[in-house]
């Protein structure tokens, strides 16, 4: 089953995905695709990184986090109902069938109608790109810092445990990662 994340129409959606690069200067390629992870690669690729850069992206999809330190979480800007569905984060570890695949389910809800503007709404209007749907605040405050690591043998267990978005959010906040190498 997929881990579920929610966002409202018009907001930025945030889909977490992490790994720990094995060595400086030699990042692991990552692809994001719309649709569940296939056997190889990503279907309907929306963003891709290589050993150093974001080398392919489509409109509204970007990496707001510290991707060169392994935070390859996807931000989808100004979401609509059509953005609902499964997204694949694939960490393309060298070697045969070594890739780590994560399916994340994005559920888009209609925007709440509020009767009058509030201070919070004013802040959101002023900084739309700097907010995530889970209220982490400005992007520059989101760092990988000193995060605990999860090794590859724990991944399947982890995937089984991530049944609800509340637990997934807790995991994101505690900063669990995959260590490569």
């Amino acid at each position: 089953s997929e881990v579920e994340y929610r966002a409202e129409v018009g907001q930025n959606a945030y889909l977490p995905c992490f790994y720990t690069p094995a060595a400086p200067g030699n990042l692991v390629p990552v692809c994001w695709g719309k649709g569940a992870c296939p056997v190889f690669e990503c279907g309907n690729v929306v963003l891709r990184t290589d050993e150093r850069d974001v080398n392919y992206w489509t409109s509204r999809y970007w990496l707001n986090g510290d991707f060169r330190k392994g935070d390859v979480s996807l931000t989808i800007e100004n979401v609509t109902l059509a953005d609902s569905g499964i997204y694949c984060c694939r960490i393309q570890i060298p070697g045969i069938m070594n890739d780590e695949k994560f399916n994340l389910k994005l559920v888009i809800k209609p925007a709440k109608v509020t009767p009058a503007p509030t201070r919070q709404r004013d802040f959101t209007a002023a900084f739309p790109r700097m907010l995530t749907t889970r209220g982490h605040g400005p992007a520059e405050t989101q760092t990988l810092g000193s995060l605990p690591d999860i090794n590859l043998t724990q991944i399947s267990t982890l995937a089984n445990e991530l049944r609800d978005s509340r637990l997934a959010n807790d995991l994101r906040d505690s900063g669990a990662t995959i260590r490569i190498g």
Epitope: P24, N26, D53, N55, W57, N64
Partner: antibody
Framework: QVQLQQSGPELVKPGDSVKMSCKAS????????MDWVKQSHGKSLEWIGY????????SYNQKFKGKATLTVDKSSSTAYMELHSLTSEDSAVYYC?????????????WGQGTTLTVSS | SIVMTQTPKFLPVSAGDRVTMTCKAS??????VAWYQQKPGQSPKLLIY???NRYTGVPDRFTGSGSGTDFTFTISSVQVEDLAVYFC?????????FGTGTKLEIK
Amino acid sequence: QVQLQQSGPELVKPGDSVKMSCKASGYTFTDYYMDWVKQSHGKSLEWIGYIYPNNGGTSYNQKFKGKATLTVDKSSSTAYMELHSLTSEDSAVYYCARGGYYSYYSYDYWGQGTTLTVSS
Amino acid sequence: SIVMTQTPKFLPVSAGDRVTMTCKASQSVGNNVAWYQQKPGQSPKLLIYYASNRYTGVPDRFTGSGSGTDFTFTISSVQVEDLAVYFCQQHYSSPYTFGTGTKLEIK
């Protein structure tokens, strides 16, 4: 301390090629990317490409594909850039710059620059 | 490729002034922006990396901020030795691109 020592100024004729060097010292050469940047007189900076000395992997700005070739000699910790089919438009100062993982591939050290003049 | 629009082109200053320059990316680059200082006849020097991190040895009067598409570089109290050209650069995706530069000059 980290140093990037570039070769001296070059005066070449249109149509010729030139190969300039960038000798690195004070750090592990294979751990960092080496990028090359062009600065035309009184103008901004243009990224040409990079090479990763560890495996020789390269990436080029589309604009400089076919114009520039990046290579390294690991044994001497030296990066090279060869420019082909030179025209007056290639007259500029060329910098090598170290792209550091710890500075997110911004350039923490730069060479002093090699001035290239293309003139008949 | 991503265009970095840097303003202003020239910035007249007096010693002690607080000055701010901006860089706007044509699309989001996360926090992957650096700021460099270049004095006449010299190579550029890294001042700020990853939008807001001051590089080793850079005085704390230099600060950077921003995320996404809008970035700001500030010198809190300009010193004579700060007279130079300042460039922003995005290193999110190749080809990495630089702003056109902001030249600090005496009023």
